[in-house]
């Protein structure tokens, strides 16, 4: 019961996390900026992974997509890649985990198969969460680095003087959504891995049960049939019924839970 709950909760937490990662990736507010000392209008600028937007005090908003790939910073490309990899892995993980859920019966799927699938999806969720956290952290680092690099940066170019406008760039809502979502996906993945341990069937091998009959000394070892089909522990094809002609070692080779004397 606890295993089912842990697995189900892990699935739900991961589902919320991956939805959050998708939302963060699509959001425009990765970085936000207020442009001050502007004689025309107060402007609020915000940027995402895919486009840059400007909102004016009048309410007018203009967004422009980053149509060029070559002109974009390598770090931005890396963040995009990390977020997409996170989404893809998470989506595959969700698909796998649906079939792995203990409460869902699909044909005659064994518990060992469900355990493997649960572990696989758990690992995928963990990697997905780490990708999202890494992506968001790289972007945040890029903002901080740009802020320190831009202080009092002024130079003269071909088209006259260019100077960096000293404005406050702050972490946008998408960064916090990404961090939380990545964390949830990670936690969900860990829960799935924990649930996997409980799902794995424990091997109960009753190796040798010996019956000391009053007449003949007979050793009955369960698994005689298994030996012929290659499933049991009796792989050397020893005679199972040996009519009592056996050594003491043979009888007591494995201590048993059920020794009837």
């Amino acid at each position: 019961m606890a295993v089912t709950a842990c697995q189900g909760l892990g699935f739900v937490v991961s589902l919320i996390g991956i939805a959050g990662i998708i939302a963060a990736t699509c959001m425009d507010q990765w970085s936000t900026q207020d442009l001050y000392n502007n004689p025309v209008t107060a402007v609020f600028n915000y940027q995402g992974l895919w486009r840059s937007c400007v909102r004016e005090s009048s309410g007018f908003t203009e967004c422009r997509g980053y149509f060029t790939l070559l002109g974009l910073p390598a770090m931005l490309q890396a963040v995009r890649a990390l977020m997409i990899v996170g989404i893809v892995l998470g989506a595959i993980g969700l698909l796998v985990s649906i079939f792995a859920l203990k409460c869902i019966r699909i044909g005659s799927m064994e518990d060992s198969a469900k355990a493997n699938m649960t572990l696989t999806s758990g690992i995928m969720f963990i990697v997905s969460g780490l990708c999202a956290i890494a992506g968001v952290s790289v972007f945040a680092n890029m903002l901080v680095t740009n802020f320190w690099m831009s202080t009092a940066n002024m130079y003269t170019g071909m088209g006259g003087m260019v100077q960096t406008v000293q404005t406050r760039y702050t972490f946008g809502a998408a960064l916090f959504v990404g961090w939380v979502a990545g964390g949830l996906t990670l936690i969900g993945g860990v829960m799935m891995c924990i649930a996997c341990r409980g799902l794995a069937p424990e091997e109960t091998n009753y190796k040798a049960v010996s019956y000391h009959a009053s007449g003949h000394s007979v050793a009955y070892k369960p698994g005689g049939f298994k030996a012929s089909t290659g499933f049991g522990s009796n792989t050397k094809n020893k005679k199972i019924y040996d009519g009592g002609a056996r050594t003491e070692d043979e009888v007591q080779s494995y201590p048993s839970k059920h020794d009837y004397v």
């Epitope: 990765w30 970085s31 900026q33 442009l35 502007n38 025309v40 209008t41 402007v43 600028n45 940027q47 840059s52 937007c53 400007v54 004016e56 005090s57 009048s58 007018f60 908003t61 203009e62 422009r64 980053y66 002109g71 910073p73 770090m75 931005l76 972007f139 890029m142 903002l143 740009n146 802020f147 831009s150 170019g157 088209g159 006259g160 003087m161 260019v162 100077q163 960096t164 406008v165 404005t167 760039y169």
Partner: nanobody, 120 residues
Framework: QVQLVESGGGLVQPGGSLRLSCAAS????????MGWYRQAPGKQRELVAG???????NYGDSVKGRFTISRDNAKNTVYLQMNSLKPEDTAVYYC??????????????WGQGTLVTVSS
Amino acid sequence: QVQLVESGGGLVQPGGSLRLSCAASGSIFNIPVMGWYRQAPGKQRELVAGISTGGTTNYGDSVKGRFTISRDNAKNTVYLQMNSLKPEDTAVYYCNVLVVSGIGSTLEVWGQGTLVTVSS
């Protein structure tokens, strides 16, 4: 790197008209504000007119009603239509743009200036 190319300056008679244009190129995500400033000999640089992406405009007191600013967002170009020019409008006119040029990077770019002379 962001470049500005200004054009349209020259000699004009009082009461005449002139149209200045300024095109921005280079690493540009957005241009929130584009505008024109001018500096007459021995005077401070002053705002002539500015325009936002959405079309919000602001004019200097001395040019209101005579000058009109417009922009083409697709071409990253700003225009200044100057009518009823006076001798006191003689100055070097500088294009000024506020450019979002990268993640966490906003630049204020000034053109090299184009001379407008109003004289008979």
